[in-house]
Interface confidence: medium
């Protein structure tokens, strides 16, 4: 906290320029008027004061609006942003795109920290929902931002935003996430042809169930392993060894490599050994000939 | 990224010195760059601060006219030429680097560790 001291003599700044990095932060905060500063924000990007000068300038400014600044204000913070407390964002009103930006701008290049996800809380929040546009700035910024959201916030992104995703921004995704933006990507891409349809549902098919699985296995996708192995256990095991055939395509031969990973393992062990041998590539651990397979989970259905 | 500063040292009322900063690991090019004084038990203020073109330069009041920033040739040095040296000068002098004028955002990132200056 800055004590309070008259400015002295001549030293009242008239408009923010260079002149003020070489003020005291007592100089700062007796001469340096809050609602000059607030109107000539964009000139305080421009200036290369110290970190401790930009706090006596936030101290000004947090006098001047104690129950948060406008949005005229917040749109030119510019680095004093780095300076803001989650506390101080929770206050704001950010309704601009152009704001949003600006201030991601600030930070770009750097992780997430906590003021930029308070940001961006609230100004979804204030859109009510993850609109295209948003999607498209956040994605732009920060791949890994859509999973770092919820289930509950993703299913406030419409199918439409779907467009705006790169298969780098769901990296990250957990499979319940995918289960939530899968359904969403279906319907976004579904007036596709099929070479395009599945280059656009690829990187989703992590939330997909196993009737969409059977169904891309008849349209000669060949999808890679890569994908295959981040598909749901429990869609992948129902797959007869022909539809995953069908559905590798070529790349059916990675199998082998995997065959002690999820969910390539579990699906083994579900599948009839003469079935496996039909592949040629030497899969182990499939049920023996002449035994009777028992689906318990259908039986318990079923009682 | 560092910058070092060297140059200081005792000096009588009127006399001068050359206070030199060296960056290592990168080129003062596109960097806003700056001497700051500490005097003890002050606080830190600025004395000079040069434009990453060196088109530009800024002068506290109590060092105009005897105080010149300038950038070497090197791409990696700053100078500050200080003349008609004051007790009041006496203080430890720290260059300072900002990257941030392409920004177009910037606040001083990098600090040297200081050179002592006394005028006595």
């Known amino acids: 906290e800055v004590e309070k001291t008259a400015c002295p003599s001549g030293k009242k700044a008239r408009e923010i320029d260079e002149s003020l990095i070489f003020y005291k932060k007592w100089e700062l905060e007796a001469c340096v008027d809050a609602a000059l500063l607030a109107t000539q924000m964009d000139r305080v990007n421009a200036i290369p004061f110290t970190y401790e000068q930009l706090d006596v300038l936030k101290h000004k400014l947090d006098e001047l609006y104690p129950q948060g600044y406008p949005e005229s204000v917040i749109q030119h913070l510019g680095y004093l942003f780095l300076k803001m407390s989650p506390e101080d964002i929770r206050k704001w009103n950010v309704t601009s795109l152009e704001t949003l930006k600006a201030l991601l701008e600030v930070n770009k290049g750097h992780e997430m920290s906590p003021q930029v996800a308070t940001l961006i809380d609230r100004f979804v929040k204030g859109r009510g929902q993850l609109d295209k546009d948003t999607l498209d700035t956040l994605t732009a910024f920060y791949p890994g931002y859509l999973c770092s959201l919820s289930p509950e916030e993703l299913s406030s992104v419409p199918p439409s935003s779907i467009w705006a995703v790169r298969p780098q921004d769901l990296d990250t995704c957990d499979p319940r996430q995918l289960d939530v933006l899968y359904p969403k990507a279906r319907l976004a891409f579904q007036n596709m042809n099929g070479s395009e349809y599945f280059v656009k549902i690829q990187s989703f098919l992590g939330g997909a169930p196993t009737e969409d699985l059977k169904a891309l296995s008849q349209q000669n996708v060949s999808m890679d392993l890569a994908t295959f192995m981040k598909l749901r256990t429990d869609a992948v095991l129902p797959l007869t060894v022909a539809e995953v055939q069908k559905l590798l395509g070529p790349h059916v031969e990675g199998l082998k490599a995997e065959e002690r990973h999820r969910p390539v393992r579990d699906w083994i062990l579900r599948q009839r050994q003469d079935d496996l041998d039909t592949l040629g590539l030497g899969l182990q651990g499939g049920i023996p000939n002449g035994y009777l397979v028992l689906d318990l989970s259908m039986q318990e259905a079923l009682s | 990224l560092q910058l070092v500063e060297s140059g200081g040292g005792l000096v009588q009322p009127g006399g001068s010195l050359r206070l030199t900063c060296a960056a290592s690991?990168?080129?003062?090019?596109?960097?806003?760059i700056g001497w700051f004084r500490q005097a003890p038990g002050k606080e830190r203020e600025g004395v000079s601060s040069?434009?990453?073109?060196?088109?530009?330069?800024n002068y506290a009041d109590s060092v105009k006219g005897r105080f010149t920033i300038s950038k070497g040739n090197a791409r990696n040095t700053l100078y500050l030429q200080m003349n008609s040296l004051k007790p009041e000068d006496t203080a430890v002098y720290f260059c300072?680097?900002?990257?941030?004028?392409?920004?177009?955002?910037?606040?001083?990132?990098?600090w040297g560790q200081g050179t002592s200056v006394t005028v006595s």
């Open positions: 300072a680097a900002s990257p941030r004028q392409l920004g177009p955002y910037y606040a001083m990132d990098y």
């Open positions: 690991g990168f080129t003062l090019d596109n960097y806003a």
């Open positions: 040069i434009s990453s073109s060196g088109g530009s330069t």
